[in-house]
């Protein structure tokens, strides 16, 4: 839009807002059980972990903000089996952490998730 | 879980992680048109804005993280009507910003959205 019609400061604020909404890795709360694939008798404590996942807007409505690079970070969680026959076990769970994002036209066939050791 | 079984530092790290995943207002990217209710001939630029929305985990699976208090913040956006007969108009769009969140058992009847002036 032509800058001549509007106050340059207003345009700057709008532009900064747009930049902040762009597709990038954002800290997200992820439910471990859902990511792992729910098992009715296995629970985790805490049930959620913080990781970075791609999110935000793209320059085109038809594009999807998706991860292009991923690192796996290990989270220490209590694994609880029901019925509780033993002490909850402290296990390392590897969670996908998106380190790079890109606006892409199609969803990948194999979305990154969680790897259990 | 009894702290005697585990290293106190490990427990502290787990607890901090859990606190950070708790239900609270989080900065979120929101698509304005979707929030407003899509009109085929009215578009916004930028199409997305940053606001705080309730998100995160609850202690029980049956609870949902929902807003208990909301403020409305005004965002300056270009409103584009199609077919484009005039210069895109700079309009104030009021967007719901969640200021308080709580883990509640049911979804509210009227989710907060966007108010147009």
């Amino acid at each position: 839009f032509a800058a001549t019609f509007y106050d340059i400061e207003t345009l700057k604020v709008i532009d900064e807002e747009w930049q902040r909404t762009q597709c990038s890795p954002r800290e997200t709360c992820v439910e471990v059980a859902s990511e792992l694939g729910k098992s009715t008798n296995t629970f985790f404590k805490p049930p959620c972990v913080n990781v970075f996942r791609c999110g935000g807007c793209c320059n085109e409505e038809s594009l999807i903000c998706m991860n292009t690079s991923t690192s796996y970070i290990s989270k220490q969680l209590f694994e609880i089996s029901v019925p509780l026959t033993s002490v909850p076990e402290l296990v390392p769970v590897k969670v996908a952490n998106h380190t790079g994002c890109k606006c892409l036209p199609t969803a990948p066939r194999h979305p990154y998730s969680i790897i259990r050791r | 879980f009894a702290a005697t079984f585990y290293d106190i530092e490990t427990l502290k790290v787990i607890d901090e992680e859990w606190q950070r995943t708790q239900c609270s207002p989080r900065e979120t990217c929101v698509e304005v048109a979707s929030e407003l209710g899509k009109s085929t001939n009215t578009f916004f630029k930028p199409p997305c804005v940053n606001v705080f929305r309730c998100g995160g985990c609850c202690n029980e699976e049956s609870l949902i993280c929902m807003n208990t208090s909301t403020s409305y913040i005004s965002k300056q956006l270009f409103e584009i009507s199609v077919p484009l007969t005039s210069v895109p108009e700079l309009v104030p769009v009021k967007v719901a910003n969640h200021t308080g969140c709580k883990c509640l058992p049911t979804a509210p009847r009227h989710p907060y959205s966007i108010i147009r002036r």
Partner: antibody, heavy 118, light 112 residues
Framework: QVQLVQSGAEVKQPGASVKVSCKAS????????MYWVRQVPGQGLEWMGY????????TYNQKFKGRVTMTTDTSTSTAYMELRSLRSDDTAVYYC???????????WGRGTLVTVAS | DIVMTQTPLSSPVTLGQPASISCRSS???????????LHWLQQRPGQPPRLLIY???NRFSGVPDRFSGSGAGTDFTLKISRVEAEDVGVYYC?????????FGQGTKLEIK
């Protein structure tokens, strides 16, 4: 108003490279993807790829992958398209086109004729 | 790649009469988000293409209301209610649902 001003016509030898520029004005350059489309004289339109000026991310048509590079200079609001290893069938008018959030190529440059001949 | 097939390739029309161009895609153009990214472009002789219609039926800025777009899935139509002399040129359909973006081969509109 939105304007896309392209560089002038070029004549190149087979095997050489060409770099076409497209200077944008009248809008926020980083808020829109820039497409590159070519048209062989008397023929239809062919999409080469696009660049997101916000972060430099590119998506190319597989047909041109390895031969084409799209870049931007946000300080001057200019997009560039470089095509390498030119062949005679690359003789075409090369257009830059801004793409709206809703998908249509809404503003076009006037085109740059690239002639490849020995 | 998505193949876009236009018919007819040439359309001689009398001034003031209607004209219709068809565009068929080799795959559905409905995006996973529910939108259909099918657009129509006009290219007058010696000029760059110009956007007429986007997302099937939305007329772009300054496009006369005699132009209209319709269709769904794989079959789309551009209609001109009353052809005027300035409408002479080549019309292209294009899709931006899939990569690579592709165009129809063009339909030449000429006056009888």
């Amino acid at each position: 108003q939105v304007q896309l001003v392209q560089s002038g016509a070029e004549v190149k030898q087979p095997g050489a490279s060409v770099k076409v520029s497209c200077k944008a004005s009248g809008y926020t350059f980083t808020g829109y993807n820039m497409y590159w489309v070519r048209q062989v004289p008397g023929q239809g339109l062919e999409w080469m790829g696009y660049i997101d000026p916000y972060n430099g991310d590119t998506t190319y048509n597989q047909k041109f992958k390895g031969r084409v590079t799209m870049t931007t200079d946000t300080s001057t609001s200019t997009a560039y398209m470089e095509l390498r290893s030119l062949r005679s069938d690359d003789t075409a008018v090369y257009y830059c086109a801004r793409t709206s959030y809703y998908g249509g190529m809404d503003y076009w440059g006037r085109g740059t004729l690239v002639t490849v001949a020995s | 790649d998505i193949v876009m097939t236009q018919t007819p390739l040439s359309s001689p029309v009398t001034l003031g009469q209607p004209a219709s161009i068809s565009c068929r895609s080799s795959q559905s153009l409905v995006h996973s988000n529910g939108n259909t990214y099918l657009h129509w472009l006009q290219q007058r002789p010696g000029q760059p293409p110009r956007l007429l219609i986007y997302k099937v039926s939305n007329r772009f800025s300054g496009v006369p209301d005699r132009f209209s777009g319709s269709g769904a899935g794989t079959d789309f139509t551009l209609k001109i209610s009353r052809v005027e002399a300035e409408d002479v040129g080549v019309y292209y359909c294009s899709q931006s649902t899939h990569v690579p973006r592709t165009f129809g081969q063009g339909t030449k509109l000429e006056i009888k």
